[in-house]
């Protein structure tokens, strides 16, 4: 899976939630960053995401002629240099700080499941997606055939504005 | 290459029903959103029908709601639209149309020809 | 649901005129939008997506601009096989199409 360009088609911030509307916070703790999935007070501002959005190829049409090739891919980051990471060894997802270009595991390709719910895929690991899991993001292997609707893996984006610089 | 037939339309009276086909091929199926698009004629496009790519979740406007159902057998690569009480403002091109991109909903990346629908008595 | 006004209906234009389509939104649509060509007979054909990219082997002379509710399709250089219907299309909340502006030779 290659990404065609370096520079992201389009960006947005957005606040993300869970399918159960809860939402996805990020907390500053001992210099490095929580995650977490919580219900929000009423008078909470909710985090913001900047989403950026990246045109691929797929594997599959990397040798023929493109046609049926194209993917979304998004990376998300919270803050300033840091973005949601997949670690698939822990089957975990984490914030990391790092520095263009963007490891691998910052990618996740875009799935709308419905027209007002998307999922995240891993780049590095396809077939696993970011999920809720006891109140925390980790990477959740979907049985494609099985489990197409699970809720766990289902998020809403509530997109603020466009955004062109953090 | 991608490609896209339309079948099944005709002339048919009101509230009389008929269902359409579109033959997809030369790409995965089964992993894109497809709907179909009308235009009335002399008219502009009207979004008709959305469905995923796993036929689970299916979207219609208003002016359809209740009387259209999109549907799709990802094993024949066939997206299908069943019209029934059919109104004579149902009269159009009936267009089927593929995502522009695996799995999102962004997008008709690529049409059909189109086949007309006549509704009249 | 949203409502996607576009204007003018129809323009005259000569080749090499610069021509300018606006699409406004009934509400905040980010950049969602599309622009989409059609001719007599034929079935529409994808311009530019997500506001300002552009389609494979559409010509660079195509582009498009804007965000929030307000977007607008430019070409720089009128040219004779762009005299066609232009659509713009937003699928931010639903789906949704303008009405359509016909590009005539002046």
């Known amino acids: 899976m290659s990404i065609t360009g370096i520079s992201p088609i389009t960006e947005s911030l957005a606040s993300l939630s869970t399918y159960n509307d809860q939402s996805i916070t990020f907390a500053l703790e001992d210099e490095s960053y929580e995650i977490y999935v919580e219900d929000l007070k009423k008078d909470k501002k909710k985090d913001k995401v900047l989403l950026s959005y990246y045109e691929s190829q797929h594997p599959s049409s990397e040798s023929g002629d493109g046609v049926d090739g194209k993917m979304l891919m998004v990376t998300l980051s919270p803050t300033k240099d840091f973005w949601l990471q997949a670690n698939n060894k822990e089957h975990s997802v984490e914030l990391h700080k790092s520095e263009k270009p963007l490891p691998d595991q910052a990618f996740f390709v875009l799935h709308n499941r419905s027209f007002n719910s998307v999922s995240f895929e891993s780049k590095t690991d396809p077939g696993v997606f970011i999920g809720v899991k006891d109140n925390h993001l980790a990477l959740i292997k979907v049985d494609y055939s099985e489990n197409l609707g699970s809720e766990n893996i289902l998020f809403k984006l509530s997109e603020i504005h466009h955004h062109h610089h953090h | 290459e991608v490609q896209l037939v339309e079948s099944g339309g005709g002339l048919v009276q009101p509230g009389g029903s008929l269902r359409l086909s579109c033959a997809a091929s030369?790409?995965?199926?089964?992993?894109?959103?497809m709907y179909w698009v009308r235009q009335a004629p002399g008219k502009g496009l009207e979004w008709v029908a959305s469905?995923?790519?796993?036929?689970?979740?299916?979207y219609y406007p208003d002016s359809v709601k209740g009387r259209f159902t999109i549907s799709r057998d990802n094993a024949k690569n066939s997206l299908y639209l069943q019209m029934n009480s059919l109104r004579a403002e149902d009269t159009a091109v009936y267009y089927c149309a593929r995502g522009h991109y695996y799995y999102t909903s962004y997008s008709l990346g690529y049409w059909g020809q189109g086949t007309l629908v006549t509704v009249s008595s | 649901d949203i409502q996607m006004t576009q204007s003018p209906s129809s323009l005259s234009a000569s080749v090499g005129d610069r021509v300018t389509i606006t699409c406004k939104a009934s509400?905040?649509?980010?950049?969602?939008l599309d622009w989409y060509q059609q001719k007599p007979g034929k079935a529409p054909k994808l311009l530019i997506y997500f506001t300002n990219n552009l389609q494979t082997g559409v010509p660079s002379r195509f582009s498009g601009s804007g965000s929030g509710t307000d977007f607008t399709l430019t070409i720089s250089s009128l040219q004779p096989e762009d005299f066609a219907t232009y659509y713009c299309f937003q699928y931010n909340n639903g789906w949704t199409f303008g009405g359509g502006t016909k590009v005539e030779i002046k």
């Open positions: 469905i995923t790519p796993n036929g689970g979740n299916t």
């Open positions: 509400q905040n649509i980010n950049k969602h």
């Open positions: 030369g790409f995965t199926f089964s992993s894109y959103w």
